[in-house]
């Protein structure tokens, strides 16, 4: 997580900045939500622990045609060290329940805010 270019600035982005930008994007999604996010699509919930960024991407990448989360998908790919494609689930990703994308985003946002407050930027 040393070089996260391409989000808001042309060069390498410090981890704290990248995390703040991801949080800002999730806040933007939740605040601008009028109709059900991604039309009520459901995704696998994740454990908000180690490997969380890749797990979040693995879950959200399956949703296509939802412009509201496309930027989030791109941003998450910058936090995940390996390439993620649809239908791919790591061993960290326990498939025990599906939740609406809106709830997924809210849960992720709350956790990322906590990490930011605690100074855990990667």
């Amino acid at each position: 997580l040393t070089c996260l270019g391409g989000f808001a600035s042309p060069g390498p982005v410090p981890p704290s900045t990248a995390l703040r930008e991801l949080i800002e994007e999730l806040v933007n999604i939740t605040q601008n939500q009028k109709a059900p996010l991604c039309n009520g699509s459901m995704v696998w919930s994740i454990n908000l622990t180690a490997g969380m960024y890749c797990a979040a991407l693995e879950s959200l990448i399956n949703v296509s045609g939802c412009s509201a989360i496309e930027k989030t998908q791109r941003m998450l790919s910058g936090f995940c060290p390996h390439k993620v494609s649809a239908g791919q689930f790591s061993s960290l990703h326990v498939r025990d329940t599906k939740i609406e994308v809106a709830q997924f985003v809210k849960d992720l946002l709350l956790h990322l805010k906590k990490l930011f407050r605690e100074g855990q930027f990667n």
Partner: nanobody
């Protein structure tokens, strides 16, 4: 486009059984992960079960584990949900869904009422 049509709902007594079916068309059914989702009166959406394209993986909400069984017949483009030991709290409209698609792609749903 994607078309899904559920059937098999109805009124059943507590402890009874029902088998829901979902006829699918307009997409490659045998390569699609499929879900059953339900909505109880006045409540939000609740995920019930998922089956992988190959039928190898089946997943259930804790609330239905051991009572419901999801299955599919790829040759008939049909998804099933066998519901046993039904409870009053299973009363809901049940929707069949192509996984990761929004409600505009879901079927109209089938109402299951569990009551004595």
């Amino acid at each position: 486009g994607v078309q899904l049509l559920e059937s098999g709902g109805g009124l059943v007594q507590p402890g009874g059984s029902l088998r829901l079916s979902c006829a699918a068309s307009g997409f490659t059914f045998d390569s699609a992960e499929m879900d059953w989702v339900r909505q109880a009166p006045g409540k939000g959406l609740e995920w019930v079960s998922t089956i992988s394209p190959s039928r190898r993986g089946t997943y259930y909400a804790d609330s239905v584990k051991g009572r419901f069984t999801i299955s599919r017949d790829n040759s008939k483009n049909t998804l099933y949900l066998q519901m046993n030991s039904l409870r009053a709290e299973d009363t809901a409209v049940y929707y069949c869904a192509k996984a990761y698609t929004g409600r505009s792609y879901w079927g109209p749903g089938t109402l299951v009422t569990v009551s004595s």
